[in-house]
């Protein structure tokens, strides 16, 4: 007995297509080995027609393909434009030769059924409607018109011009004439189901002089479109249901044992399992809409259906589209925390993954909002200014080339709790969802700035200090000036290797920033933060207001221009046993710097390329210094 499984018999008709799924046991070898479809000859030889190695025979050219779905342990052979010559015995199998594991499949392709010569064929999808055209001679104009459906023995009435309607067609069938044309009547049947398929006869008049026309109605079930997506990536279901349902409520549901459970609809229903990671977007007035799901999980795999009905729920006889979603666990998308926790007044740094092959793509961060159909307004982006209500507390740091960008949000409130999406204008599969949880703070923040009410005087020197705990000792400290284009890290230079002691005095760890002399442009938000290489940590923010000097205040002479452009990370060290070297922070290029320049700056890649100018042209100083007082025990 072969462990390969598939359909033993497949039957179709000329011109149609088949999609044959073969199932194989779940082993790594099976997933990666050659898959084939071959035709058995009288001699017992099996001639390959198509294989997963890329082979395609002449007779299948342009009309067949073979797709392997390793995550599902299946492969599918699609064959189109069938002819009677395709009738025969086949094998689907695995292995380097056609004598490997296989399963026998019998394919029978019949001629299109012999229909009366005047038969008109209508082919429609489930849920759609059909308008059958029934011509007649003028002399039958006053006579009764009717449409009946052929059964084995008789022809069962569907509708006639005396307004008789078969119960199963009530509300679905209409008999009418157009304008003044007295030679054609029409029957429209809506909300088609499988049961409506078959042979019909339309008739005008009675007896031998009656006009009759044969109709063959074929009702097709939609073949599920196969979607193959990576774990943690996103999927978009593009649903095109047609103009006739443009004004109906739309839905996406997932097949369950008994029913199709609605995941989302345009009436506001949404499955809690998809909270924060789903949007439904009506595309246009033609009944087109799409549903986007991010952060795909293993359990999201399954059979999905979209449709339209005033109830927003699946209904028999309404148009549908279907998909089979496979979720590949061998994902290229890194496994990141899907929940980030912060406290009121504190900050979070969220690492957003993007396709490393698309380092020049524009990066965005949006907040998912569930009201209505769900939407995700952009809060910040590499070329999108920060939304006004996030002034001074939100920035995006791009790190071109390493597949991650960081979004920092500080001054957190409980209102910030919710779902956020990382997305780019590139590979849409890399949209990821983060849930931000914000708890009430129960202790002092890790970073504290003094003075807290910062007002600097124009033309004078102004220093603010950022106190940090010992646990941040080995991390890089920075100050940056916030603008709605980012938080531009203030330049600094390395004062050389410093020596420090093993012990650390909790009370004296600080990094200072000095403005010298203060100018009007210095007014605004400043952040103090810590980071380790490319990984950003906590931040705290302070708003520095700038006032005119009042009479009697001392005047500070402008210092030498070069000195003013310098920001030193100063360290005061007493005693030593461990050597530490501070990282260099290189001035950031302007907002219009191109990608190539950015990548050529070396370790500057950690800076935010969307931020403003590094220093000011009039030679003002942005200096920060770090003081560490240590006592050796």
């Amino acid at each position: 007995k072969s462990p390969i499984f598939g359909p033993q018999e497949v039957s179709s008709i000329e011109g149609d297509s088949v999609s044959i799924t073969c199932y194989y046991p779940d082993t790594s070898v099976n997933r990666h080995t050659r898959k084939y479809w071959c035709r058995q000859g009288a001699s017992g030889m099996c001639t390959t027609l198509i294989s997963s190695n890329g082979y395609l025979s002449k007779e299948y050219s342009g009309r067949a393909n073979l797709i392997n779905f390793p995550e599902n342990n299946t492969f599918v052979i699609n064959i189109e434009q069938l002819t009677q010559d395709d009738t025969g015995s086949y094998k689907c199998g695995l292995g380097t030769s056609n004598r490997g594991l296989s399963f026998d499949v019998s394919l029978e392709v019949s001629q299109v059924p012999e229909l009366p010569s005047d038969t008109h064929v209508y082919t429609k999808d489930i849920g759609r409607n059909v308008t059958i055209e029934c011509p007649f001679k003028r002399e039958n104009a006053p006579s009764k018109k009717s449409l009946c459906k052929k059964t084995n023995q008789s022809c069962e009435l569907v509708i006639d011009s005396t307004e008789k309607v078969n119960p199963s067609y009530i509300g679905r069938a209409k008999l009418f004439m157009k304008g003044t044309d007295l030679t054609v009547f029409y029957v429209n049947i809506s909300h088609l189901t499988h049961n409506d398929a078959g042979l019909y006869i339309c008739q005008a008049g009675e007896g031998p002089s009656a006009d009759k026309k044969n109709v063959d109605l074929q009702v097709l079930a939609p073949e599920p479109e196969l979607l193959y997506k990576d774990l943690r990536s996103s999927v978009t279901f593009e649903c095109d249901l047609g103009r006739e349902v443009a004004n109906e409520a739309k839905y996406l549901c997932r097949m369950n044992k008994e029913t199709c459970d609605v995941i989302i609809n345009t009436l506001g229903k949404r499955d809690p399992d998809f909270e924060g990671r789903i949007l439904i977007t009506p595309k246009d007035d033609n009944g087109r809409f799409s549903v986007l799901i991010t952060g795909l999980r293993k359990e999201d795999a399954g059979h999905y259906q979209c449709g339209a009905h005033s109830s927003g729920l699946p209904q028999e006889g309404w148009p549908i589209q279907t998909w089979q979603l496979f979720v590949n666990e061998e994902s290229t998308i890194p496994n990141r925390r899907s929940v980030v926790k912060g406290v009121t007044g504190g900050s979070v740094a969220i690492a957003c993954p993007y396709n490393p092959k698309e380092s020049s793509s524009l990066k965005y961060w949006c907040r998912w909002e569930g009201d209505g159909n769900g939407h995700c307004p952009v809060l910040v982006g590499t070329q999108a200014q920060v939304q006004e209500e996030y002034e001074g507390r939100l920035a995006l740091f791009d790190q071109p080339g390493n597949g991650t960008y960081t979004v920092i949000l500080n001054q957190l409130t409980t209102e910030d709790a919710g779902f956020y999406w990382c997305l780019t204008n590139g590979d849409s599969r890399w949209r990821t969802t983060i849930e931000l949880q914000v708890a009430e703070a129960t202790r002092e923040p890790n970073l504290e700035v003094t003075p807290q009410n910062a007002t600097a005087v124009l033309g004078e020197t102004f220093t603010v200090s950022c106190h940090y705990p010992c646990k941040f000792y080995s991390q890089e400290k920075y100050w940056c000036k916030w603008s709605n284009k980012g938080c531009h890290i203030l330049p600094s230079h390395d004062e050389g290797a410093r020596q420090s002691s093993v012990s650390c005095d909790q009370s004296s760890q600080l990094v200072s920033m000095t403005l010298n002399p203060v100018s009007k442009e210095d007014e605004g938000w400043y952040w103090c933060g810590v980071k380790q290489g490319q990984t950003y940590g906590e931040t705290t923010a302070i708003y520095i207001a700038v006032e005119e000097r009042t009479r009697g205040s001392s005047h500070v002479n402008p210092t030498d221009a070069n000195a003013r452009a310098k920001v030193a990370l100063e360290e005061e060290v007493v005693d030593s046993s461990i050597s530490e070297k501070e990282n260099k922070a290189i001035p950031n290029p302007g907002p219009f710097a191109n990608e190539r320049e950015i990548q050529n700056v070396g370790d500057q890649a950690q800076e935010n390329r969307a931020s403003g100018d590094a220093g000011s042209a009039d030679g003002q100083s942005r200096s920060s210094s770090s003081k560490h007082h240590h006592h050796h025990h």
């Epitope: 359909p7 018999e9 497949v10 039957s11 149609d16 599902n72 189901t193 499988h194 089979q324």
Partner: nanobody, 129 residues
Framework: EVQLVESGGGLVQTGGSLRLSCAAS????????MGWFRQAPGKEPERDFV?????????????YYADSVKGRFTISRDNAKNTVYLQMNTLKPEDTAVYYC?????????????????WGQGTQVTVSS
């Protein structure tokens, strides 16, 4: 809601034949995957796959059979009557079981019972030696 009702079960001698029917009623029947499963005595709650039929339109069918019934059982469908049949020939004592009809909109794997949406109550088939 779709209701599936099986009939045609009964007692038969080894080598005999039976034809099971599965009639769909209730909501207009448009499932396009149907299967037969069986539960042998003492094997609850295990249901073993017997045969399945999938159609993508009224002219293209895929028929699946368990190895144990290949060549003996045939699955078919009458669209006009909303009915699926299982013709069972050359019956053996080991075919004794309750036979269930199942319907679904689509299946990833016809052998997996949880992939079907609707189920009948079952009909008893007993093959005596």
């Amino acid at each position: 809601e779709v209701q599936l009702v099986e009939s045609g079960g009964g007692l038969v001698q080894t080598g005999g034949s039976l034809r099971l029917s599965c009639a769909a009623s209730g909501r207009t029947f448009s499932s396009y995957a149907m299967g037969w499963f069986r539960q042998a005595p003492g094997k609850e709650p295990e249901r073993d796959f017997v045969a399945a039929l999938r159609w993508s339109n009224d002219r293209t069918y895929y028929k699946y059979y368990a190895d144990s019934v290949k060549g003996r059982f045939t699955i078919s469908r009458d669209n006009a009557k909303n009915t699926v049949y299982l013709q069972m020939n050359t019956l053996k004592p080991e075919d004794t079981a309750v036979y269930y009809c199942a319907g679904g909109n689509y299946f990833s794997d016809p052998r997996v019972d949880k992939e079907y949406n609707y189920w009948g109550q079952g009909t008893q088939v007993t093959v005596s030696s």
